[in-house]
Interface confidence: medium
């Protein structure tokens, strides 16, 4: 389907001239940032961004690629090198250390320099690195963490935790020897390492003692508390803070976010990760956009500003399953959250960054016609005379043989939300990829986001923009609208 107007060179010349005009008007804001927001699309490589853009456009009855995502409208872009100190292809723990703390670490460790070794508790002490969120809190800002995964998961944990093993969610996951050496589980660190004003996501089961029934699934033992130390971490968190509230469903979240007496808010909406957006019960669980809005309502009360981490964490999970439908619909909700945050904040005083921790071996090819479904088939047949999808994975559970050969695929099969795209190599889980990912930036000091940078640069840009350690002598004009 070729739009008639696009056949005319004037269309493209005019469109490019408008973009050029906008580019020429770009004025780097020389003020400091009052607020910092980092939007982290877990596993959101460039192919994911492109495919999600097309899907979001097609959901609006457009052809697809011509409609910009909210993140596409950010004026500054860079590439981020995502490798870990010990791995070409990284995990979400060590990458979180890089973009949140400004230091690269080893695979599957969080909040620790590369002097710490995976799973070796005794290498923790002395190798802790401090997140920008922690530095923002020390500077008097309010801070928040919002995610669609467990709040103890690798990416959000990078804002507050220090652990040699990202899988140590609750004390039940920590080996007895490591517990004896003083290594704390991530859930314990969530409530004790620093004062977080807003915590929203999944992960209820890691907060309560073994045998505590889950409020949403009271008869399902597997969803109940996991802790062996007998602690109720939610109760401990509430007891330490006046004006603190704990919620576990959407209705309570909405009420709490509008209540001026609530100063601290913890919302845990599932025992583990939150449900995929396509599976979410909208009466019980908030969307990522709703959680982001609730967090911004609370955090923006602080005249000194805030730091907010927002993660679309299940983009990654959809890709690991080789289910592109899940990954892309999660990306669209993530983009919706970015758009809503943009409406609720001002680029005059808020530095917003959008990036990914790593990519996935997810490809988009095969010369599909413009306007054809992103989940559809390539126009031609493969050498085996069978159809193939335009979205594919390099490896993963989509490798299936039927009578010793690659199975044929139909448009209706490939369009199913449950369909697993085919892969070249059979694995239980599709893997991360090692190529650079994009960093999008808007707001004060966003112009610093340029070129090809180490992933650690992201944390340093945030710290500098808000004049946080180690850039307290940033020599930037105060943020727009600041009174003190």
């Amino acid at each position: 389907i070729i739009p008639v107007e696009e056949e005319n060179p004037d269309f493209w010349n005019r469109e490019a001239a408008e973009a050029l005009g906008a580019a020429k008007k770009l004025q780097p804001a020389q003020t400091a940032a009052k607020n910092l927001i980092i939007f982290l699309g877990d596993g959101m490589g460039v192919s994911t961004v492109t495919a999600a853009r097309i899907l979001k456009g097609q959901k609006k009855d457009k052809l697809g690629p011509e409609i910009p995502l909210a993140m596409d409208r950010f004026p500054y872009v860079a590439l981020s090198k995502t490798y870990n100190v010990d791995k070409h292809v990284p995990d979400s723990g060590a990458t979180a250390t890089a973009y949140l703390c400004g230091v690269k670490g080893n695979f599957q460790t969080i909040g620790l320099s590369a002097a710490a070794r995976f799973n070796q508790c005794n290498t923790t002490r002395g190798n802790e690195v401090i997140s920008v969120m922690n530095r923002a809190k020390k500077a008097g800002k309010s801070v928040g963490v919002v995610t669609t995964t467990r709040v103890q998961h690798a990416s959000p944990a990078g804002t507050y935790a220090h652990t040699v093993n990202r899988n140590w969610y609750s004390d039940a996951d920590v080996p007895a020897s490591a517990r004896q050496e003083g290594c704390q589980d991530i859930a314990t660190q969530l409530i004790s390492n620093m004062d977080i004003d807003v915590i929203l996501g999944g992960g209820r089961k890691y907060m309560f003692r073994m045998g505590t029934p889950d409020p949403e699934y009271p008869d399902d033992y597997s969803q109940g508390g996991t802790r062996l130390d007998g602690k109720n971490l939610v109760q401990e968190w509430l007891a330490k803070r006046q004006g603190a509230r704990y919620v576990w469903n959407r209705t309570e979240l909405m009420q709490a976010s509008l209540d001026p007496s609530v100063t601290h808010l913890m919302g845990l909406f599932e025992p583990g990760d939150m449900k995929y957006e396509i599976h979410r019960d909208s009466t019980l669980d908030p969307s990522l956009m709703e959680m982001t809005e609730a967090a911004l309502r609370l955090l923006s009360r602080n005249p000194r500003g805030f730091f907010l981490f927002v993660e679309g964490g299940r983009i990654d999970h959809g890709h690991h399953e080789s289910r592109a439908y899940r990954a892309l619909t999660e990306t669209i909700m993530f983009d919706d959250a970015i758009e809503r945050a943009g409406q609720l904040t001002s680029e005059e005083d808020t530095l917003s960054l959008v990036t990914a921790d790593h990519s996935h071996v997810f490809s988009f090819g095969g010369y599909p016609l413009r306007g054809s479904s992103i989940f559809g088939l390539a126009p031609g047949k493969a050498r085996d005379r069978k159809a193939y999808t335009v979205l594919l994975y390099g490896n993963g559970p989509g490798y299936v043989l039927k009578d010793g050969a690659r199975p044929d695929v139909t448009e209706s099969e490939s369009g199913s939300p449950e369909y697993r795209q085919q892969s070249a190599v059979p694995l239980d889980e599709e893997t991360h990829a090692g190529e650079d990912v994009a960093v999008f930036a808007r707001g004060p000091q966003a112009h610093l986001v340029h070129g090809v940078q180490e992933q650690t640069f992201i944390a340093h840009v945030m710290a500098f923009a808000a004049c946080l350690e180690p850039y307290t002598a940033c020599d930037l004009a105060p943020p727009a609208g600041t009174t003190d």
Epitope: Y276, E277, I278, H279, R280, T283, H317, P397, V400, E418
Partner: antibody, heavy 123, light 106 residues
């Protein structure tokens, strides 16, 4: 409490048509995948059709045995699921159930079922 | 389409005893298997989902295991109310039921 109540079953001649309904209550209807399943007398359960939720555009899927003859649809304003059955055959005689999916562990297992409605296709 | 082969088609066991039913999928179903109890005149009752997770309110006498293409379902300490037909269901790729197993008490 999740409740599913089927209706519309009865006796119909071969080649005829019938429309089954399933009234749903106790949950947000638009959030859930819904299916029709049948059990012919003395035979196994057989999944027939699926209609997905709002987030996935209410797309549909059918088993090979009914594709082209049966149509699944939903009235979201009234929380009613439908199965329009055309060109009925004797082998379509069965108890027909509507079922709601639950998303445990990101699957889509059929967790809630109605009591069923009996369809008999006979001359 | 994924096919499910359930065996045995019927079995007889003593009260207090244990029975095991198996289902084999025609391809890997990634643990997306459920087990149902079916009694005439009632809708099927979900007992287990995701291979081994018991539904709320289902006694621990019921259990499930397996991976890949091979799955099993067991009932221990058989009770009179366990007389029913049991079905497996794969839900990895749309839905397919097994052929059913009719359980009788000796």
């Amino acid at each position: 409490e999740v409740k599913l109540v089927e209706s519309g079953g009865g006796l119909v001649q071969p080649g005829g048509s019938l429309s089954l309904s399933c009234a749903a209550s106790g949950f947000t209807f638009t959030d859930y995948y819904m299916s029709w399943v049948r059990q012919p007398p003395g035979k196994a359960l057989e999944w027939l059709a699926l209609i997905r939720n709002k987030a996935t555009g209410y797309t549909t899927e059918y088993s090979a045995s009914v594709k082209g003859r049966f149509t699944i649809s939903r009235d979201n304003s009234q929380s009613i699921l439908y199965l329009q059955m055309n060109a009925l055959r004797a082998e379509d005689s069965a108890t027909y159930y509507c079922a709601r999916a639950s998303f445990y562990y990101d699957g889509k297992v059929l967790a809630y079922w109605g009591q069923g409605t009996l369809v008999t296709v006979s001359a | 389409d994924t096919q499910m082969t359930q065996s045995p088609s019927s079995l007889s066991a003593s009260l207090g005893g244990k029975v095991t039913i198996t289902c084999k999928a025609s391809q890997d179903i990634n643990k997306y298997i459920a087990w149902y109890q079916y009694k005439t005149g009632k809708g099927p009752r979900l007992l287990i989902h995701y291979t081994s997770t018991l539904q709320p309110g289902i006694p621990s006498r019921f259990s499930g295991s397996g991976s890949g293409r091979d799955y099993s379902f067991s009932i221990s300490n058989l009770e009179p109310e366990d007389i029913a037909t049991y079905y497996c269901l794969q839900y990895d790729n749309l839905y397919t039921f097994g052929g059913g197993t009719k359980l009788e008490i000796k």
